[in-house]
Interface confidence: low
Amino acid sequence: KHKCFRKELEENETLESIMNTAESEEELKKYFYYLEGSK
């Protein structure tokens, strides 16, 4: 179960790194803070 959750996080991180533009680092930081908080 833990492995699956980690995989989901990795997929989300990849999606974020692709879809967020260089100009929206704040949005990206906020999202990673949310991820850290959900572990």
Epitope: L15, M19, T21, A22
Partner: antibody, heavy 118, light 112 residues
């Protein structure tokens, strides 16, 4: 104004290769993720591939994985799609689109037609 | 993959009358960041797709206010309050919540 112009389409035999390009203007190209989306004649839209603003992250649809590669040259404001081992089902209009923050494809090119036929 | 469905697939409308298109996703489009990445695109005959609505209900710049989007989770709606001749075309919903990004089959809007 913000503009995307695709080129490189044409008629190609099955199994052969083709390289599409997308020239961007009117915005800071190096700040945006870029996508390819295709549309078979008379059909719906199919997302093909994306590349991050810096070129470090790429993702592909399963239907093209291992056959298509996506790249970009930020110094020339150009996006590329290298299509290898082409199949009849790859026949479509190929659009490039800009990926804005907010997870949205906000600007689209006019498209370039790829025909795969023997 | 997330499957997107649309109803109706064809919608003949009278000029000046409202039109409504429904889009449903096979799973929730709410991402872990709390946002729902559902867009609506318009494709006029012979033209490339054009963004109308993003994140369910946000109109893209230059889009007339007769277009509106609503919904949540797995069910979404695009409404045209008063159809004009230039609105003829195919309307697609699209999800960018999860790879691979997927589109609905499209709804053809034409004039009765």
């Amino acid at each position: 104004q913000v503009q995307l112009v695709e080129s490189g389409g044409g008629v190609v035999q099955p199994g052969r290769s083709l390289r599409l390009s997308c020239a961007a203007s009117g915005f800071t190209f190096s700040s945006y993720g870029m996508h390819w989306v295709r549309q078979a004649p008379g059909k719906g839209l199919e997302w093909v591939a994306v590349i991050s603003y810096d070129g470090n992250n790429k993702h592909f649809a399963d239907s093209v994985k291992g056959r298509f590669t996506i790249s970009r040259d930020n110094s020339k404001n150009t996006l590329n799609l290298q299509m290898n081992s082409l199949r009849a089902e790859d026949r479509a209009v190929y659009y490039c689109a800009r990926g804005a923050s907010g997870f949205v494809l906000d600007i689209w090119g006019q498209g370039t037609m790829v025909t795969v036929s023997s | 993959d997330i499957v997107m469905t649309q109803t109706p697939l064809s919608s003949p409308v009278t000029l000046g009358q409202p039109a409504s298109i429904s889009c449903r996703s096979s799973q929730s489009l709410v991402r872990s960041d709390g946002n729902t990445y559902l867009s609506w695109l318009q494709q006029r005959p012979g033209q490339p797709p054009r963004l109308l609505i993003y994140k369910i209900s946000n109109r893209f710049s230059g889009v007339p206010d007769r277009f509106s989007g609503s919904g949540a989770g797995t069910d979404f709606t695009l409404k045209i309050s008063r159809v004009e001749a230039e609105d003829v075309g195919i309307y697609f919903c699209m999800q960018t919540t999860q790879f691979p990004f997927t589109f609905g089959p499209g709804t053809k809007v034409d004039i009765k």
